[in-house]
């Protein structure tokens, strides 16, 4: 099956202090390789979450990525701050034998807009 990374929401708005879910699904787990979430693109992009076991404060996976045939790589960001605003991308990599993993496909991005907390 052809690999496609889908981020269904173009944008989400969230009040500061609340949590938000960023959805991402894959049509195939092949080729073998990790899925990572980034904010921004190019040189300035920031790794937000990686489905490879590391700990990321305030960011958790929504479904159990270790389950066989799981295609849902959505994440939850808790206690959102204005600094979390930006465009988030779900990116699939192909595992390299020795060289670094190769980026092969990305979702279209979800813009996170942080609203002021209602007083």
């Amino acid at each position: 099956k052809e690999l496609k990374v889908t981020q269904p929401e173009k944008s989400v708005s969230v009040a500061a202090g609340d949590s938000t879910v960023l959805n991402c699904t894959l049509t195939s787990l092949l080729p073998v390789g990790p899925i990572k979430w980034y904010r921004g693109v190019g040189q300035s992009r920031l790794l937000i979450y990686s489905f490879t076991g590391e700990h990321f404060p305030r960011v958790t996976n929504v479904s159990d990525a270790t389950k066989r045939n799981n295609m849902d790589f959505s994440i939850r960001i808790s206690n959102v701050t204005p600094e979390d605003a930006g465009t988030y991308y779900c990116v699939k990599f192909q595992k390299g034998p020795s060289e670094p993993d190769t980026e092969i496909q990305s979702g279209g991005g979800t813009e996170v807009y942080v609203l002021a907390k209602p007083s």
Epitope: K10, S11, S13, V41, T87, Q105, S106, G108, E111, Y113
Partner: antibody, heavy 119, light 108 residues
Framework: DVQLVESGGGVVRPGESLRLSCAAS????????MNWVRQAPGEGLEWVSL????????YYADSVKGRFTISRDNSKNTLYLQMNSLRAEDTAVYYC????????????WGLGTLVTVSS | ETVLTQSPGTLTLSPGERATLTCRAS??????LAWYQEKPGQAPRLLIY???SRATGIPDRFSGSGSGTEFTLTISSLQSEDFAVYYC??????????FGGGTKVEIK
């Protein structure tokens, strides 16, 4: 059929203000993100501003930030662009453009309204 | 911001000829690229999205290809109504959404 009709263009002096309107019909206006795109005489297309269907998410091009305000009235199916502190370089045809419901490209455009800023 | 460079600036061809327009991105936009046609006094018209998918009602003489940083719009056999200005637009890196500078296809 989708119809987008811009109005409000005209000739103004530098520093003055103008308010553009875009009357939309033929689709569920509140469900779609809307944009303003402009084209200076003899130049290419330049994205100006975006507003989400609910009006919560708003973005501006750096060239207009702090001077232009995008808004919408979903009860009137109308998009607005309030343009303050106008400059000669704002002279352009301003198009109202409806975004695709999944991605940020433009399915439908109006015919545009000409704004001329000249002393 | 992702810069899109279109070439050539002007393409002078005769009806029936094949037109090949190129759009290069300063960084990968995967296949998140659209093409538009603009004629004087008319609203711009979406031709291609997702780099290669034709929009509704677009004749099959228009085709798009490419991914990453290199994209092509091909008009297989130019008709009189195809002489216009064509713009590419990326919608991966945003905001801002960016357009190429345009390619004018004119009659020889």
């Amino acid at each position: 059929d989708v119809q987008l009709v811009e109005s409000g263009g005209g000739v103004v002096r530098p520093g003055e203000s103008l308010r553009l309107s875009c009357a939309a019909s033929g689709f569920t206006f509140s469900s779609y993100d809307m944009n303003w795109v402009r084209q200076a005489p003899g130049e290419g297309l330049e994205w100006v501003s975006l507003i989400s269907g609910s009006g919560e998410i708003i973005y501006y091009a750096d060239s207009v930030k702090g001077r232009f305000t995008i808004s919408r009235d979903n009860s009137k199916n109308t998009l607005y662009l309030q343009m303050n502190s106008l400059r000669a370089e704002d002279t352009a045809v301003y198009y109202c453009a409806k975004e695709n419901n999944r991605y940020r490209f433009f399915d439908d455009w109006g015919l545009g309204t000409l704004v001329t800023v000249s002393s | 911001e992702t810069v899109l460079t279109q070439s050539p600036g002007t393409l002078t061809l005769s009806p029936g000829e094949r037109a090949t327009l190129t759009c290069r991105a300063s960084q990968s936009v995967y296949t998140y690229l659209a093409w538009y046609q603009e004629k004087p006094g008319q609203a711009p018209r979406l031709l291609i999205y997702g780099a290669s998918s034709r929009a509704t009602g677009i004749p099959d003489r228009f085709s798009g290809s490419g991914s990453g940083t290199e994209f092509t719009l091909t008009i297989s056999s130019l008709q009189s109504e195809d002489f216009a200005v064509y713009y590419c637009q990326q919608y991966y890196d945003r905001p801002p959404l960016t357009f190429g500078g345009g390619t004018k296809v004119e009659i020889k």
